[in-house]
Interface confidence: low
């Protein structure tokens, strides 16, 4: 008996030759003997199964003695023993129908699990292995599971399904719902306009949820929420939002947040949120903003940093164009009696400048200028 | 949404043929069977047969099997029913129809009066 | 062929009340625990719109005063409350098997 796997949703052709190459009676039958379809010299014929208009014939290909079952949109239970009756012979071929799905949905948040099951008919016993977008191999038997999904795992899964030393591939598109990046940084000198922006590292037609960002400064002793918003079909509009610091939000996609100017007391972390619709969980983005301030008083030049900043980072003054004076893996470095000039606070990490703050040294009968 | 969109009217001599368009958008033209069903003035529904644009598959009542072709074009996403040896028996709204998810027809054509007259 | 009639060919009914359509077939639609029946509604000049299918399924957005039942070949459509806009011609047709067949209709008038 010839065997044929076939995909779910898919079409498939069961071929049933005769010897002569001409139009003859034929007629497909399924395992209980009900008519599916069959001729009357040119005319097709159906019978009453259950496959209804899914079922058809390629009568171009009757005059050479073919006379195929073409099976749409395939479903588990149209597995069976399908006879063709052509030239007081029968012919049977066994079409199993496998489908292959993912848990609930394809569009799943970073850090959840991706279970895709396979449907297959009663009595077989296939086994499967499927290959992720970034190659990890994975097997199973009606169910495999990936814990902790990563943001590289978004693409094409691709999974052979095994039965009767035959195969049938299965391509299920698994999108990760994630910020582009986990975590961001922002370094700003005293007074300037801060911009954050929280880019999604996938695309749908609509887009739909709501988000928060909470904000933890550092000489705060608890978190405060800054703004609340609502998304509608990648729409923007705030619901609420804090009047110190009063941020401003971007009306469309991606979510770009502007607070009106950098202060040590916003210094810290803040964690955005995104819960959309239809999702169990959401999506998180850390963004955190370090602040720089330089300042002259009396006979002591100061420069500071306030936010989350690492500890092999240097914190530098120096006269321009001369050698460092001071610099520390401190969050503050100062220098008594600092000479005329310009000076230069350099915030940097093994040698690359991140932050860099200019205060004019004015001799000492003058008050400093802070360009 | 789904939509079937059909041509206008036509007026025919006796032993003449139509040929009646409808034009299917909202959906994937190839994944359903396009109906076509007659309607003689204040009569009822008579199915007249099936196409399936994918293939070109078309199956017809045995009343009209001598007399009806349909075809399919996949490229505009438009399906014909050609009618020829017109009688005036043959004057009648056409409708072209499209299941929904189960069995019966959920979508139909806005219809085509054929008027067949010396 | 699998003929379908109709009874009444026309009834009269009053806004609130019951009207009850049957359709007979010359052979069981039955396949499989499914009845393949369908019912319509038309209105002058549009094309008929699908009430009922696998006789007893309410179509989406049909309001729930149309009910259908039914197996084997004898079908009912059921308009309960009846209201003015209901005035149409009713149509059951088996997709059992081809050809297709629609009965030859119920006219309903709102009295």
């Known amino acids: 008996k010839k065997v044929v796997l076939g995909k779910k949703g898919d079409t498939v052709e069961l071929t049933c030759t005769a010897s002569q190459k001409k139009s003859i009676q034929f007629h497909w039958k399924n395992s209980n003997q009900i008519k599916i379809l069959g001729n009357q010299g040119s005319f097709l014929t159906k019978g009453p199964s259950k496959l209804n208009d899914r079922a058809d014939s390629r009568r171009s290909l009757w005059d050479q003695g073919n006379f195929p079952l073409i099976i749409k949109n395939l479903k588990i239970e149209d597995s069976d023993t399908y006879i063709c009756e052509v030239e007081d012979q029968k012919e049977e071929v066994q079409l199993l129908v496998f489908g292959l799905t993912a848990n609930s949905d394809t569009h799943l948040l970073q850090g959840q699990s991706l279970t895709l099951t396979l449907e297959s008919p009663p009595g077989s016993s296939p086994s499967v292995q499927c290959r992720s977008p970034r190659g990890k191999n994975i097997q199973g038997g009606k169910t495999l599971s990936v814990s902790q999904l990563e943001l590289q795992d978004s693409g094409t899964w691709t999974c052979t399904v095994l039965q009767n030393q035959k195969k049938v591939e299965f391509k299920i598109d698994i999108v990760v719902l994630a910020f582009q990046k986990a975590s961001s940084i922002v370094y700003k000198k005293e007074g300037e306009q801060v911009e954050f922006s929280f880019p999604l590292a996938f695309t749908v037609e609509k887009l739909t949820g709501s988000g928060e960002l909470w904000w933890q400064a550092e000489r705060a002793s608890s978190s405060k929420s800054w703004i609340t918003f609502d998304l509608k079909n990648k729409e923007v509009s705030v619901k609420r939002v804090t009047q110190d610091p009063k941020l401003q939000m971007g009306k469309k996609l991606p979510l770009h947040l502007t607070l009106p100017q950098a202060l040590p007391q916003y210094a810290g972390s803040g964690n955005l949120t995104l819960a959309l619709e239809a999702k169990t969980g959401k999506l998180h983005q850390e963004v955190n903003l370090v602040v720089m301030r330089a300042t002259q008083l009396q006979k002591n030049l100061t420069c500071e940093v306030w936010g989350p900043t690492s500890p092999k980072l240097m914190l530098s003054l120096k006269l321009e164009n001369k050698e460092a004076k001071v610099s520390k893996r401190e969050k503050a470095v100062w220098v008594l009696n600092p000479e005329a000039g310009m000076w230069q606070c350099l915030l940097s990490d093994s040698g690359q400048v991140l932050l860099e703050s200019n205060i004019k040294v004015l001799p000492t009968w003058s008050t400093p200028v802070q360009p | 949404q789904v939509q079937l969109v059909q041509s206008g009217p036509e007026l025919k001599k006796p032993g003449a043929s139509v040929k009646v368009s409808c034009k299917a958008s909202g959906y994937t033209f190839t994944d359903y069977v396009i109906h076509w069903v007659k309607q003689a003035t204040g009569q009822g529904l008579e199915w007249i047969g099936e196409?399936?644009?994918?293939?070109?598959?078309?199956y017809s009542n045995a009343k009209f099997k001598d007399r009806v072709t349909m075809t399919a074009d996949k490229s505009s996403n438009t399906a014909y029913m050609e009618l020829s040896s017109l009688t005036s028996d043959d004057t009648a709204v056409y409708f072209c129809a499209r299941r929904g998810n189960g069995t019966g027809f959920a979508y139909w054509g806005q219809g085509t009066l054929v008027t067949v007259s010396s | 062929d699998i003929v379908l009639t109709q009874s009444p060919a026309s009834l009269a009914v009053s806004p609130g009340q019951r009207a009850t359509i049957t359709c007979k077939a010359g052979q069981s639609v039955d396949y499989d625990g499914d009845s393949y029946m369908n019912w319509y509604q038309q209105k002058p000049g549009q094309p008929p719109k699908l009430l009922i299918y696998?006789?007893?399924n309410l179509e989406s957005g049909i309001p729930s005063r149309f009910s259908g039942s039914g197996s084997g070949t004898d079908f009912t459509l059921t308009i309960n409350p009846v209201e003015e806009n209901d005035t149409a011609t009713y149509y059951c047709q088996q997709s059992y098997k081809d050809p297709l067949a629609f009965g030859p209709g119920t006219k309903v008038e709102i009295k």
């Open positions: 696998v006789a007893s």
């Open positions: 196409i399936y644009p994918g293939s070109g598959s078309a």
